[in-house]
């Protein structure tokens, strides 16, 4: 019996093939056990981690991972050369920059070496799985008596990223947030000089170079306000 099971996980064009064997008895072999799903994330297009839940196996199993790129010059099957481990059992594979081709369909295959027919294959669009590093070098400029401008840097192509800015004062219970496009600049037009403000930013690889759903980590926060603004009223970039 050869079945194809679709396992959508928020990444389009994702398929998993599970190979099952029919048994003469009522009991089914280990081949029927589904393999864990592989989740891949590309970190700032510097390396990629593809991981699985090794504890979902009924007994500790060193699953193996192979990969290739569909319909491309890179369609030769490659073995994982750098496994990640969890309690001495394989739980992932790390691919280096030169092995990452964002805009080709990435095919990843997980296999049980003790039961070679027990394997699962997924196809992933890596441009939708990029997670950039957190924004850095946040700076605040006072444009006028009541207007602040927040700037930051990213260690990636500016136009590939969108951003989310959050800010609040010490008097606020929740964050106010604002989406910012690739220009990575945010202005707060009305600032209360009596309050202390905290700002933070995160970034996402969307929509111009890919369609990633996951945000970066938050930047280190930056503060502005009553007890700090007297020191330098025009520029302040102290991190918490």
């Amino acid at each position: 019996l050869n079945t194809t099971i679709l396992t959508p996980n928020g990444n389009e064009d994702t398929t998993a093939d599970f190979f099952l064997t029919t048994m003469p008895t009522d009991s089914l072999s280990v081949s029927t056990l589904p393999l864990p799903e592989v989740q891949c994330f590309v970190f700032n297009v510097e390396y990629m981690n593809c991981t699985w839940n090794s504890s979902s196996e009924p007994q500790p199993t060193n699953l193996t991972l192979h990969y290739w790129y569909k319909n491309s010059d890179n369609d030769k099957v490659q073995k994982c050369s750098h496994y990640l481990f969890s309690e001495e059992i394989t739980s992932g594979c790390q691919l280096q920059k030169k092995e990452i081709h964002l805009y080709q369909t990435f095919v990843v295959q997980l296999q049980d070496p003790r039961e070679p027919r027990r394997q699962a294959t997924q196809m992933l669009k890596l441009q939708n799985l990029v997670i950039p590093w957190a924004p850095e070098n946040l700076t605040l400029h006072k444009l006028s008596e009541s207007q602040l401008e927040l700037n930051w840097n990213n260690r990636f192509l500016n136009h590939c990223l969108e951003h989310l800015v959050q800010y609040r004062t010490d008097w606020d219970h929740s964050w106010t947030e604002q989406s910012v496009d690739y220009r990575h600049k945010f202005s707060l037009p009305s600032v209360d000089g009596q309050k202390r403000y905290t700002f933070r930013v995160r970034s996402r690889f969307n929509p111009l170079c890919g369609s990633a759903q996951h945000w970066s980590e938050w930047s280190h926060p930056i503060h502005w306000g009553s007890n700090t603004s007297k020191e330098n009223p025009f520029l302040f970039a102290l991190e918490a």
Epitope: V45, H101, L102, R155, L157, N158, L208, C209
Partner: nanobody
Framework: QVQLQESGGGSVQAGGSLRLSCTAS????????MGWYRQAPGNECELVST???????YYADSVKGRFTISRDNAKNTVYLQMNSLKPEDTAVYYC???????????????????WGQGTQVTVSS
């Protein structure tokens, strides 16, 4: 931060030559496919030429045989040598950087203002 900086534009007679340069920050240049776009007043942003990180190139039909793109990885710089210039080459030229493989496998229209300020090229007849 300014990630791409163009230079080398100017005014020239038809038939003349110019060489545009674009310098990128190291972390941008190393893993990017680089390209040149142009935009004339009232026109859309037009892809002129690209060079991938492995050195393969693309040219728009309108510039084939006249323009040459190259990259100097040691200097983080991409060049556009423009020969036999025509009045219709008059535009603001923008240097662009894309994730590796973008041009050959993904594509999609771009706005010229995604990148720097550009450099003006004016060709008079």
């Amino acid at each position: 931060q300014v990630q791409l900086q163009e230079s080398g534009g100017g005014s020239v007679q038809a038939g003349g030559s110019l060489r545009l340069s674009c310098t990128a920050s190291r972390f941008i240049f190393d893993d990017s496919d680089m390209g040149w776009y142009r935009q004339a007043p009232g026109n859309e942003c037009e892809l002129v030429s690209t060079i991938s990180s492995d050195g393969s190139t693309y040219y728009a039909d309108s510039v084939k045989g006249r323009f040459t793109i190259s990259r100097d990885n040691a200097k983080n710089t991409v060049y556009l040598q423009m020969n036999s210039l025509k009045p219709e080459d008059t535009a603001v030229y923008y240097c662009a950087a894309e994730p590796r493989g973008y041009y050959s496998n993904y594509g999609g229209r771009r706005e010229c203002n995604y990148w720097g300020q550009g450099t003006q090229v004016t060709v008079s007849s």
